[in-house]
Interface confidence: medium
Amino acid sequence: MQKGDQNPQIAAHVISEASSKTTSVLQWAEKGYYTMSNNLVTLENGKQLTVKRQGLYYIYAQVTFCSNREASSQAPFIASLCLKSPGRFERILLRAANTHSSAKPCGQQSIHLGGVFELQPGASVFVNVTDPSQVSHGTGFTSFGLLKL
Amino acid sequence: MQKGDQNPQIAAHVISEASSKTTSVLQWAEKGYYTMSNNLVTLENGKQLTVKRQGLYYIYAQVTFCSNREASSQAPFIASLCLKSPGRFERILLRAANTHSSAKPCGQQSIHLGGVFELQPGASVFVNVTDPSQVSHGTGFTSFGLLKL
Amino acid sequence: MQKGDQNPQIAAHVISEASSKTTSVLQWAEKGYYTMSNNLVTLENGKQLTVKRQGLYYIYAQVTFCSNREASSQAPFIASLCLKSPGRFERILLRAANTHSSAKPCGQQSIHLGGVFELQPGASVFVNVTDPSQVSHGTGFTSFGLLKL
């Protein structure tokens, strides 16, 4: 699976984890059918994917959530893919927004984010949502990953 | 387009096909603007993409469907990306769920799934939906593919 | 970041730009956290990504929009990923459709498109939507890109 000793494959796919924390940052785990190619990408503190090598990466996240218009705030459910590199400000790379469903008790919706970005050594990417309590953690519903081009 | 004789590009993109079968597994065809890089990935029985080489693959599917809350079951429309490896149980890799629309006669919605997974030689991936009769087969609406990293 | 002199990395990620033009083709810019790997892929006229080398490309687009059922046409919001190759007719590669929300003044929804396609030298890809005035241009909401396998 090596591209060569100097250019190993770097890829990760991690699985959502329910969390009692009130933070808007989603939690992830190396469980189920996860991918962690080698130590050039790591899952840190269960919340961010950190890369050791500079380069172009395709980064993606999928979030399934269940919400109801009446029970939620006026604002839509937003999922954000964020980047923090050493010596750089936190940046939003991608966002998706879905207005809450009128279905009761809640209506499920899925969001997919993905794009190609330049990452520096030590850069971390993570996923923020407006309301983590609405996220669905059933098998396959919510995941996060990247691959180095 | 070769990475080298030992490491050829492997990729596929197939197009949805309406089916009279009552199975929940979607049917696909090599038609329209499809991709099939070589015989290291094949479309089998019109329903699964099968790979010959072990490795990391980015696998994706897009499903557009049209449904109505009153005419559908209470359960949401769910699309699942599934894996069957030789000698292993079938497993769900990714799922997305969308509650049915209140629009009449039906409301269209699109789901996108994608992630990086390790596949064994002879592994097959396929797409399940809760109600195949609701899937839209117009040009470009529903497709399925993969690429080897 | 080179795969080798003969096989450089080719990738792009561009950011949506609001436009006063009435055309259904979305406008893009090299701004914010964009990617343009080298001159083997270019953004032309702010509307299309053009590649110089033949090969397989993973092409994607994300469109977030805000619409209301009563204020919109009966037809759903459709985003289309289109291809124009030299000497060939324009063709649709991918489409996604979402019925307008009943939320007021409008309900936000996000669409993601992505797939692997063979592109010829000089081929251009672009994104069409049914109503560009409904597209959301806030940070990260709407973007377009590709990567060469």
Epitope: T23, K47, Q48, P86, G87 | - | -
Partner: nanobody, 123 residues
């Protein structure tokens, strides 16, 4: 030791212009995103603008968009803030700040600040 030294502040009439400078030392300036933050009398800190390490990408608070321009000269290790069409509400101490080396979630945006330069907009 990291040092950030602001200059260029002063008294200016409404509608006037000023250019603030920030001389950086003690770190590799060209490797860091930089920003400007201000504190009006009796108020909290307000982010004004920031710029990426190569000067490619800039961001502005809505309150200054179209009037202020952030820039940098990596060869001179200097950050700038050009302020045009100044208003009374722009009166504040302006601080130059360096992006934090921390990574990940809930990290501080800045880790080093200058001493600040006072801008007073008054007729």
């Amino acid at each position: 030791e990291v040092q950030l030294l602001e200059s260029g502040g002063g008294l200016v009439q409404p509608g006037g212009s000023l250019r603030l400078s920030c001389a950086a030392s003690g770190f590799t300036f060209s490797h860091y995103d930089m920003g400007w933050v201000r504190q009006a009398p009796g108020k909290g800190l307000e982010w004004v603008s920031d710029i990426d390490y190569i000067g490619k990408t800039t961001y502005y608070a809505d309150s200054v968009k179209g009037r202020f321009t952030i820039s940098r000269d990596n060869s001179k290790n200097t950050l700038y803030l050009q302020m045009n069409s100044l208003r009374a509400e722009d009166t504040a101490v302006y601080y130059c700040a360096k992006a934090s080396d921390e990574v990940g979630v809930n990290t501080s945006k800045f880790d080093y600040w200058g001493q600040g330069t006072l801008v007073t907009v008054s007729s």
